[in-house]
């Protein structure tokens, strides 16, 4: 790990805050064709607002209407499907939320069909039990992935029974999916209900659906695909954390700091401190003291939460979680406010805002 | 070209530790991962553990958690396998070997493939 | 841990010869096996991965097919370099574990 050893007395110059980008899947949205969805950017302090779909700038048009954090769809059709994403700028960082939409009848999606864990998987084609396409496993249907680091290889797969067998074929984007569509093609296993895309790249991103039919029926079901190029940067911070706190004298209080890093991260718990009356050196940058550091007994979810038991007055002030790598440092800070214990008349000086 | 190289190796007592260095060149290092694989004299090959250069998170075979543990520098472009507590049953040859995700979207897992290898380099430990 | 047993341990052939090894994971790892191959002194070399997919470079002469816990490595017609130890793994548990491997020899 690479190590940045702050002790009491060091100083921390400021950096500029990373963009921040949403770790966790996409909420789906769903709606029926014809039918209207209103979605809110869940996105703070948003200054400016961008959207795109499947990676492409979206504007307004006679059934998009952008106001403000909020996107309007009148009369969805299936076309409106996709991966959804606000990104707002704001004059330190932009932050990025992703959101799916599926527009789909649903039983032409075949995931709400009724059906076994599997046991009809391999239904004789010469027997007269005739049956229409289904997912073997619908709940496995449900599963869809965010993003996928670039570089790497995207299986889909839509296991389906019927009889007879049914056909499988794949498109992107609503589109026949070629092989000459991507630079190394892909790779079919019709056995295994599979496609795999090798060393994907960001213009793999987009909306991949099989087709499963045969002569009594078509069944079709959607991968939303998004492919995240990785470059090394220093430690992204999850916006927000820490938040300030407040508790009375002799209350516990905790500070939690998600942190997101290529290289391995190391990362401190620091309290801004006083030192022979003033909270700067000479050279204006504060004093600091750690409270915390990763050492070798230490997981990294025990030091993204900072404990402060049985609090007093001497513990109110600004506490940093400070992340660095060999590429560079990180941190956010929030303010902890003591007040007296109910029944006390000694009162505190409010806190200053949230600093980051 | 994709080219790893280990080096580190050498003959080590009991107890002893030893650093494992694996070198990588011709892929973008932080998009996939770096696995250390081992092969005693005349066995077969033993999973020992895997690194993701994209989110720093490690996994270890049980054989050698606590003991060893892997790390990565990016701006090197190099992982690390520092080996401790050095057993006479931790002798064998050491393979790093770049490792990306299948990324299956039907099922909740990734499948880890080891696609390029380094020459490997012979760890001994004996008194 | 998922055990991974490979058969033979050995077999001998010759040039020309279908060679068929085969893999039985102690449970169900779905397709997540990959097949790789080694020479005595070198690195293991990558074949197929998720059980049935033909590694880029790697000739068509191989191939792979099962899942769930049996598992194929087929070479439709062995050529002099063939002539190496071959192993399978999975990695949908953990840890990723390795057949004992099968070495193919010059009958």
């Known amino acids: 790990r690479p190590s940045f050893s702050l002790v009491e007395d060091t100083t921390l110059e400021p950096e500029e805050p990373p963009t921040k980008y949403q770790i966790s899947q996409p909420e789906v949205y769903v709606a029926a064709p014809g039918e209207s969805l209103e979605v809110r950017c869940l996105l703070k302090d948003a200054a400016v607002i961008s959207w795109t779909k499947d990676g492409v700038h979206l504007g307004p048009n006679n059934r998009t209407v952008l106001i403000g954090e909020y996107l309007q769809i009148k009369g969805a059709t299936p076309r409106d499907s996709g991966l959804y994403a606000c990104t707002a700028s704001r004059t330190v960082d932009s932050e990025t939320w992703y959101f799916m939409v599926n527009v789909t009848d649903a039983i032409s999606s075949g995931d709400d069909e009724d059906d076994t864990d599997g046991a009809e998987d391999f239904v004789s084609e010469n027997s007269n039990n005739k049956r229409a396409p289904y997912w073997t496993n619908t709940e496995k249907m449900e599963k869809r992935l965010h993003a996928v680091p670039a570089a790497n290889t995207v299986k889909f797969r839509c296991p389906a029974g019927g009889n007879p067998m049914p056909t499988m074929r794949w498109l992107k984007n609503g589109k026949e999916f070629k092989q000459e569509h991507r630079i190394g093609g892909y790779k079919v296993r019709n056995q295994h209900w599979s496609l795999i895309m090798e060393s994907v790249v960001p213009s793999d991103k987009g909306n991949y659906t099989c087709v499963v039919e045969n002569e009594y029926g078509s069944i079709n079901h959607t991968y939303h695909l998004d492919v995240v190029e990785r470059s090394p940067h220093r430690p992204i911070l999850q916006a927000g954390l820490p938040a300030n706190a407040s508790t009375v004298v002799g209350g516990d209080v905790e500070f939690v700091c998600k942190v997101y890093s290529d290289a391995q991260p190391h990362i401190q718990w620091i309290k801004h401190v006083e030192k022979n009356g003033s909270k700067y050196g000479p050279d204006g940058l504060p004093y600091l003291k750690v409270l915390k550091a990763a050492g070798v007994n230490t997981t990294d979810k025990e030091i993204e939460v900072l404990y402060i038991r049985n609090v007093t007055f001497e513990d109110a002030g600004e506490y940093t979680c400070l992340a660095g790598n060999s590429i560079g440092i990180s941190f956010h800070s929030a303010w902890l406010t003591v007040l007296p214990a109910p029944g006390r008349e000694k009162e505190i000086t409010a806190s200053p805002d949230y600093l980051e | 070209e994709v080219q790893l190289v280990e080096s580190g190796g050498g003959l080590v007592q009991p107890g002893g530790s030893l650093r494992l260095s694996c070198a990588a060149s011709g892929f973008t290092f932080t998009s996939t991962g770096i696995s250390w694989v081992r092969q005693a004299p005349g066995k077969g090959l033993e999973w020992v553990g895997r690194?993701?250069?994209?989110?720093?998170?490690?996994n270890y075979a049980d054989s050698v958690k606590g003991r060893f543990t892997i790390s990565a520098d990016t701006s090197k472009n190099t992982a690390y396998l520092q080996m401790n507590s050095l057993r006479a049953e931790d002798t064998a040859v050491y393979y790093c070997a770049r490792t990306y995700g299948i990324y299956d979207l039907y099922v909740d897992y990734t499948e880890y493939v080891m696609d390029y290898w380094g020459q490997g380099t012979l760890v001994t430990v004996s008194s | 841990d998922i055990q991974m047993t490979q058969s033979p341990s050995s077999l001998s052939a010759s040039v020309g010869d279908r060679v068929t090894i085969t893999c039985r994971a102690s449970?169900?790892?779905?397709?997540?096996l990959a097949w790789y191959k080694q020479k005595p002194g070198k690195a293991p070399k990558l074949l197929i991965y998720s059980a049935s997919f033909l590694y880029s470079g790697v000739p068509s002469r191989f191939s792979g097919s099962g899942s769930g816990t049996d598992f194929t490595l087929t070479i439709s017609s062995l050529q002099p370099e063939d002539f190496a130890t071959y192993y399978c793994?999975?990695?949908?548990?953990?840890?990723?574990?390795f057949g004992q491997g099968t070495k193919v020899e010059i009958k």
């Open positions: 449970q169900d790892v779905d397709t997540s």
């Open positions: 690194t993701h250069l994209g989110d720093g998170s490690t």
């Open positions: 793994q999975q990695s949908t548990g953990h840890p990723q574990t």
